[in-house]
Interface confidence: low
Amino acid sequence: NECPELQPPVHGKIEPSQAKYFFKDQVLVSCDTGYKVLKDNVEMDTFQIECLKDGTWSNKIPTCKIVDCRAPGELEHGLITFSTRNNLTTYKSEIKYSCQEPYYKMLNNNTGIYTCSAQGVWMNKVLGRSLPTCLPVCGLPKFSRKLMARIFNGRPAQKGTTPWIAMLSHLNGQPFCGGSLLGSSWIVTAAHCLHQSLDPEDPTLRDSDLLSPSDFKIILGKHWRLRSDENEQHLGVKHTTLHPQYDPNTFENDVALVELLESPVLNAFVMPICLPEGPQQEGAMVIVSGWGKQFLQRFPETLMEIEIPIVDHSTCQKAYAPLKKKVTRDMICAGEKEGGKDACAGDSGGPMVTLNRERGQWYLVGTVSWGDDCGKKDRYGVYSYIHHNKDWIQRVTGVRN
């Protein structure tokens, strides 16, 4: 018995294509690239029908439906633009991912262009089906310093010029240390900020001496020391990591990392600092910021900063030799011979940064660590040298500039 003539579906074909079909003849219905066979609301690659004894086909010819990649995945810190009218998500449609500029940029300068493939998956020429990554931009504050300051005997910082600075605060709102934002969820600070004062009779650091993540919080976007303002972001602490070679007695490797419970939103007042690309040149000018004590032992109302030069390592070692204090290779010194400009109590862990004039970007040089009193003549401020421990920082945080 002969079965009726078959019409292939729109955007599809039937094989074999014959003038006539008889009992037991089978045909395979398939669709053009970018289309799927749709039968009874079920999508499939092909569909087979057979000519029956009574001269009818075993099933109706299915339709061919264009492949739909559906709504593209959301990109953290990114946006999606549809290149096709009506925001189409079907075969050959195109979308473009971009990062929330100017605070995030796309890793490897990827085009961000994805096309809906015949398989129903958004595909990028380089990344395949993986989404691009938006990385935080570091060291490029929206507000630049109008004047360079010449925390101890320093000047009030201009709001927004130090967007990487973090305040470590007790739950009662009392600040106790500074820090710097790295990447989107890490704070680098001084290890000595994260433990209680040790018993001089038995100066051994025990786990019980460490601050628990629930003992303190991080405040970013802060300008005033105690007054709250609109740009602050208060963040919980997930985890703290002290440098494995930190020595609380000598302050060697006085650096620690605080992982945030959640990422801050980057904006004009909150932005990470860049990690150093190489060693710091002696004599280079650096800026140190903090809310620590000022002249006459008073705390300032706002963030303060000083501009001071990096001091030759051997000069610094000689300055501290009479006090039997070691200035080791993981430390870097800054200040002026005549004194007067220095970090002080409460500045610990805060940033010492320098400007790369070619790139216009700020880099972290050190974190406030120790010194003999504050701003004393012939005594320099000693800072934990970030370049020395950069590998450890990158290993723990995964942060790259």
């Epitope: 709250s228 972001q233 208060h234 919980g236 801050p264």
Partner: antibody
């Protein structure tokens, strides 16, 4: 905007899930909280889900409620409702982006009414 | 858990007058306090955060003050539209939010 849905009359012990649908902003940037108000009574804080998905419940609400979220919705499941759970349930967005610290609420939905009765 | 005790309801005042509502915390809350206004059948509206910061769009007739355990909301130049119930909220973060986020019982303001 923020809009709650799913409120209805349920019998005691029948689990009920309320949904908060957001538009105009991303849940990956904001913390979202649930607050309820029994008829003629004051506001009562239930819990908050952070932009990263960390969930914090009021002590009294632990075990009684479950908060979860998708990319555009935040759900509040009342695990085993009692008549005392009869209230209008509000979903609200926290003021500070990326900060569970400042869990005061500056964008509220209109609320959805749940009545628990046998 | 922190307990917030508000001025007893109702508080009555005339149009053009001033109303003061107090909120007392059972322990120091470090100015982590917000004030809300709620009219019958409506959603709450944020007025003040950080004890004294005015939320955007809120008239300057509303002001907040206080520290430690004692906080105050003041409404001056009262208008009939100010008739509502006012709540204080102590807010906290992270693990401390379990018992930290709590509302006062509310204070109803009536305009004569």
């Amino acid at each position: 905007s923020v809009e709650e849905s799913g409120g209805r009359l349920v019998t005691p012990g029948t689990p009920l899930t309320l949904t908060c649908t957001v538009s105009g902003f991303s849940l990956s940037n904001y913390n979202m909280g649930w607050v309820r108000q029994a008829p003629g009574e004051g506001l009562e804080y239930i819990g908050i889900i952070s932009s990263q998905g960390d969930i914090y419940y009021a002590t009294w609400a632990k075990g009684r409620f479950t908060i979860s979220k998708t990319s555009t919705t935040v759900d509040l499941k009342i695990t085993s409702p009692t008549t005392e759970d009869t209230a209008t349930y509000f979903c609200a967005r926290a003021r500070h982006v990326g900060s569970a610290a400042d869990s005061y609420f500056h964008l509220w939905g209109l609320g959805t009414l749940v009545t628990v009765s046998s | 858990a922190v307990v917030l005790t508000q001025t007893a309801s109702p508080v009555s005042a005339a149009v053009g007058g001033t109303v003061t509502i107090n909120c007392q915390a059972s322990e120091e809350i470090y100015r982590n306090l917000a004030w809300y206004q709620q009219k019958p059948g409506q959603r709450p509206k944020l007025l003040i955060y950080g004890a004294s910061n005015l939320a955007s769009g809120v008239p300057s007739r509303f002001s907040g003050s206080g520290s430690g355990t004692e906080y105050t909301l003041t409404i001056s130049d009262l208008e009939s539209a100010d008739a509502a119930t006012y709540y204080c909220q102590r807010y906290a973060w992270g693990k401390n939010s379990a018992d930290g986020n709590t509302f006062g019982g509310g204070t109803k303001v009536e305009i004569k």
